[in-house]
């Protein structure tokens, strides 16, 4: 694992987008509540959205957005197991991920929509923890008394921390592998171009690689296919 950590430190520039990212940790099988505070005056009249970041510079795929009528933004809207509700006066967007699963881990954004544009309110890194209380009595329902007792064991009272400038984040393995792959692909592409130029070949034939970036036996970075904004 140590070589991997050293490799990660080399790739940390690839995770520049994770600076000022807030980490929310949730327990598998339970619910996770993500809050995104914002300036209610600045974003007055704007609908909000929750999207999943597909890769470092990829698009942010919409998961769910608030009610089409801004005045009804307080109404909870669902897409599958993800809900969104907006306290427009208090300036807090709340996203609930129910029945959290390992594949929910990843980078997300809270967005403020205006026309076809979207401002990022907060970048969120969702981490999924193994359930430390697998046989806990309370089961999957959430009771405030339990969250005060167990603190981080019940995750709708979620753990969050900010990744400030200068702090080196250590994100989930799936993201790190993706970044490592991107980094290595860049190196391979550069090497191929250099080799092609050196040998006078066409820069189309890459040397075979044994790296299979799409398949991590432990954790796969799964995107959410065909999500519709209901």
């Amino acid at each position: 694992m140590e070589p991997l950590r050293l490799l990660i430190l080399l790739f940390v520039t690839e995770l520049s987008g994770a600076h000022n990212t807030t980490v929310f940790q949730g327990v598998a099988g339970q619910s996770l509540q993500v809050s995104c505070p914002y300036d209610s005056m600045k974003h007055w009249g704007r609908r909000k959205a929750w999207c999943r970041q597909l890769g470092e510079k990829g698009p942010c795929q919409r998961v769910v957005s608030t009610h089409n009528l801004w005045l009804l933004s307080f109404l909870r809207r669902w897409n599958g197991s993800t809900a969104i509700t907006d306290d427009t006066l208090g300036g807090t967007l709340t996203i609930t991920l129910r029945n959290l699963q390992p594949h929910d881990a990843g980078l997300y954004q809270c967005q403020s929509l205006h026309g076809s544009e979207a401002d990022t309110l907060r970048k969120v890194l969702v981490e999924v923890l193994a359930d430390p209380l697998d046989h806990r009595d309370a089961g999957d329902l959430w009771f405030p008394g339990e969250s005060e007792s167990f603190e981080d064991a019940h995750v709708e009272h979620s753990i969050s921390r900010s990744l400030l400038e200068g702090e080196i984040p250590f994100p989930p393995t799936s993201i790190l592998l993706l970044l490592a792959c991107i980094f290595l692909i860049k190196i391979l592409a550069a090497s191929a171009l250099w080799a092609a130029a050196w040998h006078g070949q066409k820069p189309g034939t890459h040397p075979p690689s044994e790296l299979d970036c799409g398949h991590d036996p432990g954790y796969q970075l799964q995107t959410l296919p065909g999500l519709r904004d209901t």
């Epitope: 099988g29 339970q30 619910s31 509540q33 909870r76 669902w78 197991s81 509700t85 709340t94 609930t96 129910r98 029945n99 009595d137 309370a138 089961g139 999957d140 329902l141 959430w142 009771f143 405030p144 008394g145 339990e146 005060e148 007792s149 709708e156 009272h157």
Partner: antibody, heavy 122, light 113 residues
Framework: EVQLQQSGPELVKPGASVKISCKTS????????MHWVIQSHGKSLEWIGG????????SYNQKFRDKASLTVDKSSSTAYLELRSLTSEDSAVYYC???????????????WGQGTSVTVSS | DIVMSQSPSSLAVSVGEKVTMSCKSS????????????LAWYQQKPGQSPKLLIY???TRESGVPDRFRGSGSGTDFTLTISSVKAEDLAVYYC?????????FGGGTKLEIK
Amino acid sequence: EVQLQQSGPELVKPGASVKISCKTSGYTLSEYTMHWVIQSHGKSLEWIGGVIPNSGGTSYNQKFRDKASLTVDKSSSTAYLELRSLTSEDSAVYYCARGDDSYRRGYALDYWGQGTSVTVSS
Amino acid sequence: DIVMSQSPSSLAVSVGEKVTMSCKSSQSLLYSSNQKSYLAWYQQKPGQSPKLLIYWASTRESGVPDRFRGSGSGTDFTLTISSVKAEDLAVYYCQQYFSYPPTFGGGTKLEIK
């Protein structure tokens, strides 16, 4: 109008099982939790457990963990309570009740079914 | 489990009178994050299902007459009916939903003289 319509009274033999249904209408089942409460004759109310229809996640009162099983069928907007290994002590009225979730009102039970009477007798 | 104790177990009042009933919990129901007490009051009329009257200790459910008022915080709670009507004949239960498992009080039976 929100309605919770429970199945009719049951007369069952000791040791048998019974499955009570709670058909919901007037709201989206998956947006609320569903709870089951028992009321033994002339007594107070006891929470059996609750289910999150969206995920199927459940929570049981320790006392009823070996007695009850909660499920939902989202396609028919129906919640179920199955009771097993019944004894005469399980004779009671069983209610389904809609619970809001923890963000608005916690699990205050705002709509109740009419109750299903279960009598265990040989 | 949190124990909910209601008193009195029964009381008889005349129409138009003010009535108060008490509910005490064995531990605080106040959630520090939102400063709300996770306590509800229900009314169960003879032969009927329970009906939610009050949640978060003092918030009236929509459609509930304003003669019903919930108060209290932490461990001591009160349900007050400012001017009793004949239709208020029922058993009143308090319930905590602060901690697993949710528990109900034994009930207060309100009779009309």
